[in-house]
């Protein structure tokens, strides 16, 4: 039975040209995390593997930085970066947990961070 929950940074907004940290945290399970994938819609941005370290997809290397921790930093944001981002935790023995973050990239300087929320 999957008992874990993923806490994410939730709905967030950031200014065009700025950067933002995408963070997820898996709790309430003793399952072992083997890998975390970061995806934007259907595109793989990055992988952090417990044994093999980080791999950033070549097409995102200039604008995506690993960390902090198992999180991901998006840099030089454009309005086109607006959308859904997913952290996918591969665990044993539970299986896969997915967290969702919605990022809105704003033209103005009125970028406010949304509240944290949980996805069971």
């Amino acid at each position: 039975m999957m008992t874990g929950t993923i806490e994410t940074t939730g709905n967030i907004s950031a200014e065009k040209g700025g950067s933002i940290i995408l963070q997820c945290h898996l709790s309430s399970t003793t399952a072992q995390v083997t890998q975390v994938n970061w995806e934007q819609q259907d595109q793989l941005l990055a992988i952090c593997n417990a044994d093999l370290g980080w791999h950033i997809s070549p097409s995102f290397k200039d604008r995506v930085a690993p960390g902090p921790g198992l999180g991901l930093t998006l840099q030089s944001l454009t309005v086109n970066d607006t959308g859904e981002y997913f952290c996918i935790y591969h665990t044993y023995p539970d299986g896969t947990y997915t967290g969702r973050i919605f990022l809105e990239v704003l033209e103005s300087s009125v970028a406010e961070h949304g509240a944290r929320f949980q996805i069971p």
Partner: antibody, heavy 120, light 107 residues
């Protein structure tokens, strides 16, 4: 206390194969990946590859594919590296090494090293 | 593969002196860098990880710094036990690679 104890020095003939062992103690053997590192001429360090003792999964440095084969025996908490078709270039000290922790891919624990001399 | 270039290859210094060893990565490795010390005939020992975090039991005279592609290991007030070889290693993503080493000798 984490301990990695390797087998003793070996003198082998060119063309032969041989197996080095690394006995682990002081921690859960199946919970941590085992790495192997080659040190030539007492200087250059090269990562050979790793094995996950839990499932036997391996990842090799391209340079050592076909040269090294990594295996484990869970019942004795021992990792093995077989070196194939030995030449003088394979004369070196070989270390087993364990990561600090999951997602912490630096080598916190090392075996004492096994000196392999290839000579006719 | 990421290439790690260390300098100098060798260094002579006296007890009490301060020395700095540098390591350059062929591409951005952020702060994913470790330093090791190795004495003659012994295994490498972890000194620093994540570019600047001292491993357990490592004296505070050692310090690591840098990020991106340029890194350094500084040893203040050298002690007799500090002489030996030093290696950097990136821990960003496999294959892990090491610098060529710096041999620190007593002057």
């Amino acid at each position: 206390e984490v301990k990695l104890v390797e087998s003793g020095p070996e003198l082998v003939k060119p063309g032969a194969s041989m197996k080095i062992s690394c006995k682990a103690s002081g921690y859960s053997f199946t919970g941590y990946t085992m790495n192997w590192v080659k040190q030539s001429h007492g200087k250059n360090l090269e990562w050979i590859g790793l094995i996950n003792p839990y499932n036997g999964g391996t990842s090799y440095n391209q340079k050592f594919k076909g040269k090294a084969t990594l295996t484990v025996d869970k019942s004795s908490s021992t990792a093995y590296m077989e070196l194939l078709s030995l030449t003088s270039e394979d004369s070196a000290v070989y270390y087993c090494a364990r990561y600090a922790n999951r997602f912490e891919n630096w080598f916190a624990y090392w075996g004492q090293g096994t000196l392999v001399t290839v000579s006719s | 593969d990421i290439q790690m270039t260390q300098s100098p290859a060798s260094l002579s210094a006296s007890v009490g002196e301060t020395v700095t060893i540098t390591c350059r990565a062929s591409e951005n490795i952020y702060s994913y860098l470790a330093w090791y010390q190795q004495k003659q005939g012994k295994s490498p020992q972890l000194l620093v990880y994540n570019a600047k975090t001292l491993a357990e039991g490592v004296p505070s005279r050692f310090s690591g710094s840098g990020s991106g592609t340029q890194f350094s290991l500084k040893i203040n007030s050298l002690q007799p036990e500090d002489f030996g070889s030093y290696y950097c290693q990136h821990h960003y993503g496999t294959p892990w690679t090491f610098g060529g080493g710096t041999k620190l000798e007593i002057k």
